[in-house]
């Protein structure tokens, strides 16, 4: 099939006092092989500080996955989610506390 770019969505949730979990979700993409990872100040976080979901079919012939990490509240602006898929790439910021979702569809 032809390439379908992912929709990338970054969310935040309270983890514990002073910490938040930021989750980057990619959905609706084809083929399955996608790079999704967190960066701090533009530098990759180690694997052991990130949690990944499996790449799973979403029932529409495309795929979905996610990556999450825990960060200190107030440092959100230092973190970005990086995506590579089928020769394209993009970075996605953590939304500020008063907004909840950032959606980006990439072509």
């Amino acid at each position: 099939g032809s390439t379908v770019p992912p929709m990338v969505n970054v969310t935040r949730s309270e983890a514990s006092e002073g910490n938040i979990t930021v989750t980057c979700r990619a959905s609706g993409f084809y083929p399955w092989n996608i790079t999704l990872s967190w960066r701090q100040d533009g530098v990759s976080l180690s694997h052991d500080t990130q949690q990944w979901g499996d790449v799973l079919p979403d029932g529409n012939g495309t795929y979905q996955t996610w990556v999450a990490t825990r960060i200190c509240q107030g440092e959100e602006q230092r973190f970005t989610c990086y995506m590579e898929h089928s020769g394209n790439h993009s970075t996605h910021p953590v939304p500020s506390g008063n907004s909840h979702h950032h959606h980006h569809h990439h072509h």
């Epitope: 092989n33 996608i34 790079t35 999704l36 990872s37 960066r39 533009g42 530098v43 990759s44 180690s46 694997h47 052991d48 990944w52 979901g53 499996d54 790449v55 996955t65 990556v67 990086y82 590579e84 898929h85 089928s86 020769g87 394209n88 790439h89 993009s90 970075t91």
Partner: antibody, heavy 120, light 107 residues
Framework: QVQLKESGPGLVAPSQSLSITCTVS????????VNWVRQPPGKGLEWLGM???????DYNSALKSRLSISKDNSRSQVFLKMNSLQTDDTARYYC??????????????WGAGTTVTVSS | DIQMTQTTSSLSASLGDRVTISCSAS??????LNWYQQKPHGTVKLLIY???SLPSGVPSRFSGSGSGTDYSLTISNLEPEDIASYYC?????????FGGGTKVEIK
């Protein structure tokens, strides 16, 4: 068919800088990372750093002050520059494509390597 | 940095033998481990990724296992073309680090 090929100077004088080019084919540098790894004679492998599809770089902190990795997507080339070479930088230098899919991160295709000798 | 130790630097085995190569990490690396084969002339090839996954084109006589800090690569039926050095590599933490290698020779 994915291929990577390193080209370097062969011989570098101590305190001078090293420049190596990795020319790739069969994939786009815009969408996958390339790593640099070296191997001193008779020793093991050492990861130097990498460049991602968007041009961001990660370096081995032990060498970060001397290293620079860049690329030219249109020419399908990745460049390694290392400053202030000493004799213990004598090694075979490899570039390798990085595959980073969730929990999996590996170097799936390697170049043949180029030998660099630091000597006066 | 995480230290990777391959205690056996070289071993001799007969064709058809089952060969096991061990690798230990200085801390838990959560299965974030790959194995590479380096032929005597220097060519490097990915053999196993994420502890036990086999890339396409790698013969099924190669297998990997382990968890925590201890991992192994097994060649179930040694062939002449398996004469090479084998390196483990962790990617749990940056920088990725390699073991010192195990050279496999024919008796």
């Amino acid at each position: 068919q994915v291929q990577l090929k390193e080209s370097g100077p062969g011989l570098v004088a101590p305190s001078q800088s090293l420049s190596i080019t990795c020319t790739v084919s069969g994939f786009s540098l815009n969408g996958q990372g390339v790593n640099w790894v070296r191997q001193p004679p008779g020793k093991g492998l050492e990861w130097l750093g990498m460049i991602w599809g968007d041009g961001s770089t990660d370096y081995n902190s032990a060498l970060k002050s001397r290293l620079s990795i860049s690329k030219d997507n249109s020419r399908s080339q990745v460049f390694l520059k290392m400053n202030s070479l000493q004799t213990d930088d004598t090694a075979r230098y490899y570039c390798a494509r990085g595959a980073h899919y969730g929990k999996r991160w590996y170097f799936d295709v390697w170049g043949a390597g180029t030998t660099v000798t630091v000597s006066s | 940095d995480i230290q990777m130790t391959q205690t056996t630097s070289s071993l001799s085995a007969s064709l058809g033998d089952r060969v096991t190569i061990s690798c230990s990490a200085s801390q838990n690396i959560n299965n974030y481990l790959n194995w590479y084969q380096q032929k005597p002339h220097g060519t490097v090839k990915l053999l196993i990724y994420y502890t036990s996954s086999l890339p396409s084109g790698v013969p099924s006589r190669f297998s990997g296992s382990g968890s925590g800090t201890d991992y192994s690569l097994t060649i179930s039926n040694l062939e002449p073309e398996d004469i090479a050095s084998y390196y483990c590599q962790q990617y749990s933490k940056l920088p990725p680090t390699f073991g010192g290698g195990t050279k496999v020779e024919i008796k």
